[in-house]
């Protein structure tokens, strides 16, 4: 018996086509992606083939102006246009709290959205039971296939999911879920969820009578044979990890932003073994045609988007100077604000011992595109934020060795002077820098703040510790030559879009007079 | 090979109850959302109720709605409808058919030959 | 309710005929569109679904297009046992809606 899965994951609010990069779709003969584009292909295969199933892995949310406006209501509303069989809950469908996620979304979707490893408590039990559930079992054709979901233990950390969720360790609440579906007689089960690829590969390892792993967060293209696009693979798709019990399993993710979509067939023998798995993601490029029935409809959900994009978020009353002449040069207040946005956007009360679980920002200079004038009124508008912020990206959340963020601030005045993007705008550090010193050893002083402490103060940075810190997606990967941090980094989350950080900062202060504070200094 | 096979139709007297039956083989049952649809004589076809695979939704048009009861016995792979408070305007052949393995809604990809449904004082 | 409007609402045509039958949505129904055959005293029969995917078992001669309102089933050489009523029905959303129908006769 043959079952054909279709699957995407970390969609981002990528609702329209985009470009190459997944950034907003300049010229539309080479746009990718997008629902509309996404629809005609998954038509085409439910066409062509008798069993199939469409699944998402989680962080449908977050992303474009479209999260930022329809808060969730248009994923559940293009899913089940799309007739999506199942979802796992990502870390950010709780980035408006759970209250964000029961009301758009779960009351919403016609599909059952599953976590085997989201444990509700206290008055949200009663709330939310029924609403997400551990597995679902789904029949396809003659045949019953079992989806059984999980989502990242780190959540807590990543968004909002509030103190009445408890996140378990993926594995160890997996299995009696699995265990369970095995005695109602389903020998086909399927793990749908959002962990990153290496706790999928555990997964595959670990839990016994998983056939199939289906995953997202951590942006995994595999692939076999020749890639078609940009993204470099981390393995061939499937990818195959033996378990723990002599089972070949297979593993797949579809990359990010709709860009992708994941095609894997499996072949199940009359006792429900994986025969045989094959398979590629299939890239949604301009040469499948948009549906014009949903380009229809997201062109009506659009026209709200252009009338937010020009309202006022809040006021500054002081210039906002976003110029390269500032940012790539000094401490620059538009770095300051955005820097603070980041943290302020990554307050999460740990526990006792720490005030918060994150203190420090990094930010490219050359990120920053441009100025806010103040004697417009002070009004800011989504549209003045993404001239600020153009590119579409993410401020995320990495873990790195003091060592590392030292060659880091090294990188950052290595040819100072240039008007060069990699100079560091900061949050939650001090920096001095005595540009007489030869490159590579400018950095006299690097103090910052602590997280384990009541009263937050500057502390000398220590090489070999583990720092939290929030910085842009591009820094993560290695972009404006921060190689280091993309080697060298020991965990990294993508976290919000930019502009929808700093926005959600703007609304919340109201009015905004950042200052600059000696945060970089040069002795 | 798949059958659907209506019974229970017959002539009833306006205001009265009828129960119809939908007897399956040849797929399994339990996997498929079962419909009603009902055709007047010389006139086209109306849908008249659905039952998920699981029994978890039922859906009606306004025109049955608090008279109709769809119901299924995935153990005797048996769906039946329960007709309530019947006026003249039920009169019709009502068949079986066969929707989709989701909570979509669906079309119909097999039919039962259909029963014949009269409601007459 | 979305409303499923079909024409003609009959025809005349003769063997190895093309013939075109039209139905229109109301509103917006994606590519959620069926079409079936009907002869007389007989339980309808499924030729399409999603708008435009041949039912197995089909003769390749029938055909469907359209998404969104407008949609289209088309024979492309009409033989002698395809005499009968066509009917389109949409499975966007409950309730689901037949057309009128379209009863194609011999000229």
């Known amino acids: 018996w043959e079952l054909t899965i279709l699957h995407t994951n970390d969609v981002h609010s990528r609702l329209e086509q985009t470009s190459e990069d997944s950034s907003k779709c300049v010229n539309a003969s080479r746009c990718m992606g997008g629902v509309a584009r996404l629809f005609t292909k998954v038509q085409q295969i439910r066409r062509a083939e008798p069993n199939v199933l469409l699944l998402d892995a989680g962080d449908q949310y977050q992303g474009t102006i479209w999260f930022t406006v329809y808060k969730g209501a248009e994923v559940a509303h293009f899913m089940n246009a799309l007739r999506y069989d199942a979802m796992a809950l990502g870390n950010h469908e709780f980035d408006n709290g759970v209250e964000g996620l029961i009301e758009p979304l779960l009351k919403e979707a016609k599909f059952p959205i599953l976590s085997a490893n989201i444990k509700a408590k206290g008055p949200l039990a009663s709330q939310i039971s029924g609403l997400y559930l551990p597995y679902k079992v789904l029949p396809v054709g003659d045949e019953v296939v079992g989806i059984v979901g999980y989502t990242s233990k780190e959540t807590p950390f990543l968004s909002n999911p509030g103190t009445n969720l408890v996140f378990e360790d993926e594995i160890t609440a997996l299995q009696p879920e699995v265990d369970k579906l095995k005695t109602l007689n389903v020998n086909k089960i399927i793990a749908l969820g959002h962990s990153g690829f290496e706790t999928d590969k555990l997964i595959a390892q670990k839990v016994r009578g998983v056939d199939v792993v289906v995953g997202g967060h951590s942006n995994t293209f595999l692939y076999t044979g020749n890639p078609p696009s940009k993204e470099v693979p981390a393995g061939k798709y499937p990818f195959i990890v033996t378990s723990d019990d002599g089972r070949k399993v297979p593993v797949v993710q579809a990359y990010a932003f709709g860009k992708y979509l994941g095609y894997l067939k499996i072949e199940f023998d009359e006792r429900g073994n994986v025969i045989s798995s094959h398979g590629n993601p299939i890239l949604l490029n301009s040469s499948i045609p948009e549906d014009p029935s949903i380009k229809a409809d997201i062109n009506k959900w659009r026209i709200k988007l252009d009338n937010y994009s020009t309202q006022e978020l809040g006021k500054t009353i002081v210039y906002l100077d976003g110029s390269s002449q500032s940012c790539r040069f000094r401490e620059c207040n538009m770095g300051n604000l955005i820097c603070d946005a980041m943290i302020n956007n990554n307050l999460r009360h740990a526990d006792e011992m720490f005030w918060n679980h994150v203190s420090m920002c990094i930010l490219n200079g050359g990120g920053i595109r441009s100025p806010i004038d103040e004697r417009n009124n002070g009004t800011i508008t989504w549209e003045n934020l993404a001239a600020v912020l153009p590119f579409g990206g993410t401020f995320d959340l990495v873990q790195l060795k003091g060592s590392t963020l030292k060659k880091a601030f090294e990188h950052s005045v290595h040819r100072y002077g240039q008007s060069t993007g990699e100079f560091l705008q900061v949050g939650g550090i001090h920096v001095v820098y005595d540009l007489s010193r030869k490159p590579g050893d400018r950095v006299v002083k690097l103090d910052v703040l602590c997280t384990k402490c009541r009263v937050p103060s500057y502390d000398p940075l220590k090489m070999d510790e583990i720092y939290k810190v929030i910085l842009p997606n591009f820094l993560a990967n290695g972009g404006d030559g921060f190689q280091m941090i993309k080697d060298e980094l020991l965990r990294h989350d993508s976290g919000d879009q930019d502009i929808n950080v700093v926005s959600t900062y703007i609304s919340k202060m109201k009015v905004i007079y950042p200052a600059v504070e000696g945060r970089i200094k040069f002795s | 090979q798949v059958q659907l096979v209506e019974s229970g139709g017959g002539v009833v007297q306006p205001g009265r109850s009828l129960r119809l039956s939908c007897a399956t083989s040849?797929?399994?049952?339990?996997?498929?959302?079962m419909h009603w649809v009902r055709q007047a004589p010389g006139k086209g076809l109306e849908w008249v109720a659905v039952?998920?695979?699981?029994?978890?939704?039922?859906y009606y048009p306004d025109s049955v709605k608090g008279r109709f009861t769809i119901s299924r016995d995935n153990s005797k792979n048996t769906l039946y409808l329960q007709m309530n408070s019947l006026r003249a305007e039920d009169t019709a052949v009502y068949y079986c058919?066969?929707?989709?393995?989701?909570?979509?809604?669906?079309?119909?990809?097999?039919w039962g030959q259909g029963t014949m449904v009269t409601v007459s004082s | 309710d979305i409303q499923m409007t079909q024409s003609p609402s009959s025809l005349s045509a003769s063997v190895g005929d093309r013939v075109t039958i039209t139905c229109r949505a109301s509103?917006?129904?994606?590519?959620?569109l069926a079409w079936y055959q009907q002869k007389p005293e007989k339980a309808p029969k499924s030729l399409i679904y999603?708008?435009?995917s041949l039912q197995s078992g089909v003769p390749s001669r029938f055909s469907g297009s359209g998404s969104g309102t407008d949609f289209t089933l088309t024979i492309s050489s009409l033989q002698p046992e395809d005499f009968a009523t066509y009917y389109c029905?949409?499975?966007?959303?409950?309730?689901?809606?037949f057309g009128g129908g379209t009863k194609v006769e011999i000229k």
């Open positions: 029905q949409q499975y966007n959303s409950y309730p689901l809606t």
């Open positions: 058919a066969r929707g989709g393995s989701s909570w979509y809604p669906d079309s119909f990809d097999i």
């Open positions: 509103q917006g129904i994606s590519s959620w």
């Open positions: 999603a708008a435009s």
């Open positions: 039952i998920l695979y699981d029994g978890s939704n039922k």
């Open positions: 040849g797929f399994t049952f339990s996997n498929y959302g």
